[in-house]
């Protein structure tokens, strides 16, 4: 399915979170081992009634710099974001599309590990992998290599370590060409691919109707973002939780900080930062507690992540034309009618008083004045026959009086205008309106 | 479009007091002639008593100086203060507007009263 509106063009990027993984106890600060965006992804527009294409994602690996020793266990958070690309008042709109999360081990200088997650309709592929900046070696990046020109006992393409310079260390050298963005090697000579990427080199985009691949170079965090299979069929489970299939189902085997039918219930705790445009996270800072956002006005979404349309409240009254500026809501009110939420009808009688002691009347929300004696018009300017207006309802007749006009009403009917009538026609010993009508709908007499 | 809902009917003994209200919406009531029927069972409706626009009310022979009908239009509801209620009365009461703005006419959907010992 698009990720965009029709109306609207849209594209995509995405925020990595990451954290040490390594204390139950301490809630450590967001995102405390790094965290990074990605590059925008190509500006993409649905076209009506075309069938979904392929998903144009952010160009380039994402990497996340981290200072210090890597932990070997981690957290991480990653958001697929909606940047709309429209005329929106303060620039472009942000909201968040799919949230994963997870805890994992992870040895630096290992191979790409590859993750499937799944947010709603959503899944996430991904790949990743810890990699130690030169001269930071080893498992957790805390050994350090001697400079090249420093002298070496290791033989040829080997290069000395300290502290223990008997360890020497072959750099692993994949097949030639192999691209240093989609591809990656174990052993020396290989070229293994990363989701998404295919043939010798790793430099053929995948394309399948069932993924929604990247377009050109891709993303080392994201290989595709696809609506989920069914049940054990490309793992229910979300958070690396393992499926097994049941007599009836499927039951998933959660990783710690994970729960729900489908280990759905994140582990992300308000020490994440979980919470978007100024909402407040409530909840225990232990990993396997969960939180609750508690949304400033104008957002919502379990996140705050979405912000709230105001106007599909219908807060304008009486047919206004509902604004939402983003800081206020503004009615445009229709004619004859004003108030912030147009909740005013207006007889206009204020800014325009009737002549000759005319009366001014509502008139359909605009402005209407009732004549005196011998005056008309719209504002009792004009000299009249009283009687012109037929004042006189169910065919009462007028006469035009000294005092004011008088109504001879027809038999039947009575009231200062014969707007009573003493039976109402067609209501026998057993409707409860007259035929036709039901209670409330409006009869029409001339 | 206008929109009437009675409340206030009920049972009650001979001589006793009843007061009526219909709440208007779609227009206020300082606009609309208002007016309560009632239909007791085997006879046609019949108007009761009535209030125009300027103010101005009318009554039918049987009820005068028993019944009184008045309009609140902060409220915008118009009611009917029924005192020295007869067995006779015993009807289901309908709230009606006449709209001059398109001459239509509006009724609620009706509201029981039953006077009975």
């Known amino acids: 399915r698009s990720p965009c509106s029709a109306r609207l063009p849209c594209r995509l990027f995405f925020r990595v979170c990451l954290k040490p993984g390594l204390s139950e106890e301490a809630a450590e600060s967001p995102c405390a081992l790094g965290a990074a965006l990605s590059a925008r992804g190509p500006v993409y527009t649905e076209q009506p009634g075309a069938p979904a294409p392929d998903l144009p994602l952010p160009d380039g690996l994402l990497q996340v710099p981290f200072r210090d020793a890597w932990p070997g266990t981690f957290s991480f958070i990653i958001e697929t974001w909606r940047e709309e690309l429209g005329d929106q008042i303060g620039g472009p709109a942000w909201s968040l599309l799919a949230r994963v999360a997870g805890r994992r081990r992870l040895a630096a200088g290992g191979p790409w590990a590859r993750d499937i997650q799944r947010a709603g309709a959503w899944e996430l592929r991904f790949s990743y992998r810890a990699r130690c900046e030169p001269p930071a070696v080893g498992t957790a990046c805390t050994r350090l290599c001697r400079p090249r020109s420093a002298p070496s006992r290791c033989g040829p393409g080997l290069r000395p370590c300290a502290p223990l310079e008997d360890e020497c260390e072959a750099p692993l050298v994949c097949r030639a060409g192999c691209s240093p963005e989609h591809g990656f090697c174990e052993q020396p000579g290989e070229c293994r691919c990363l989701e998404g990427w295919t043939g010798p080199l790793c430099t053929v985009p995948v394309s399948t109707s069932s993924c929604l691949s990247p377009r050109g170079p891709s993303s080392a965090t994201t290989g595709c973002l696809v609506p989920g299979p069914g049940p054990c069929d490309g793992n229910p489970c979300a958070n690396g939780g393992s499926c097994s299939e049941t007599p009836r189902s499927f039951e998933c085997t959660c990783p710690r900080g994970f729960y729900g039918l489908r280990c759905e219930v994140s582990g992300v705790t308000c020490a994440d930062g979980p919470c978007f445009n100024g909402g407040l996270c409530v909840g225990g800072a232990d990993p396997d507690s969960a939180y609750i956002c508690h949304c400033p006005p104008g957002f919502q979404g379990s996140n705050c992540e979405k912000r709230v349309d105001r106007c599909s409240l219908q807060p304008c009254r009486n047919g206004g034309l509902c604004l939402d500026l983003g800081h206020a809501l503004r009615c445009r009110c229709r004619a004859g009618f004003a108030g912030p939420r147009c909740e005013h009808d207006l007889d206009d009688c204020a800014g325009r008083a009737c002549a000759n002691g005319g009366t001014c009347v509502e008139g359909g929300g605009a402005h209407r004045c009732s004549c005196a004696l011998g005056f008309g018009g719209r504002d009792c300017r004009e000299r009249a026959d009283p009687c012109a207006a037929r004042p006189c309802a169910h065919g009462g007749r007028c006469y035009a009086h000294f005092s004011g006009l008088v109504c001879a009403c027809a038999p039947g009917y009575m009231g200062a205008r014969c707007e009573f009538p003493v039976h109402p026609d067609g209501a026998s010993a057993l409707p409860a309106a007259p035929p036709g009508l039901r209670p409330g709908d409006p009869q029409r007499y001339l | 479009q206008v929109q009437l809902q009675e409340s206030g009917g009920g049972l009650v003994q001979p001589g006793g007091s009843l007061r009526l209200s219909c709440a208007a919406s779609?227009?206020?009531?300082?606009?609309?002639?208002m007016a309560w029927y009632r239909q007791a069972p085997g006879k046609k409706r019949e108007l009761v008593a009535g209030?125009?626009?300027?103010?101005?009310?009318n009554y039918v022979d049987s009820v005068k100086g028993r019944f009184t009908i008045s309009r609140d239009n902060a409220k915008n509801t118009v009611y009917l203060q029924m005192n020295s209620l007869q067995p006779e009365d015993t009807a289901v009461y309908y709230c009606y507007a006449y709209r001059w703005v398109g001459r239509y006419t509006y009724w609620g959907q009706g509201t029981q009263v039953t006077v009975s010992s």
């Open positions: 209030i125009s626009t300027d103010g101005s009310t």
């Open positions: 779609g227009s206020s009531v300082s606009f609309l002639s």
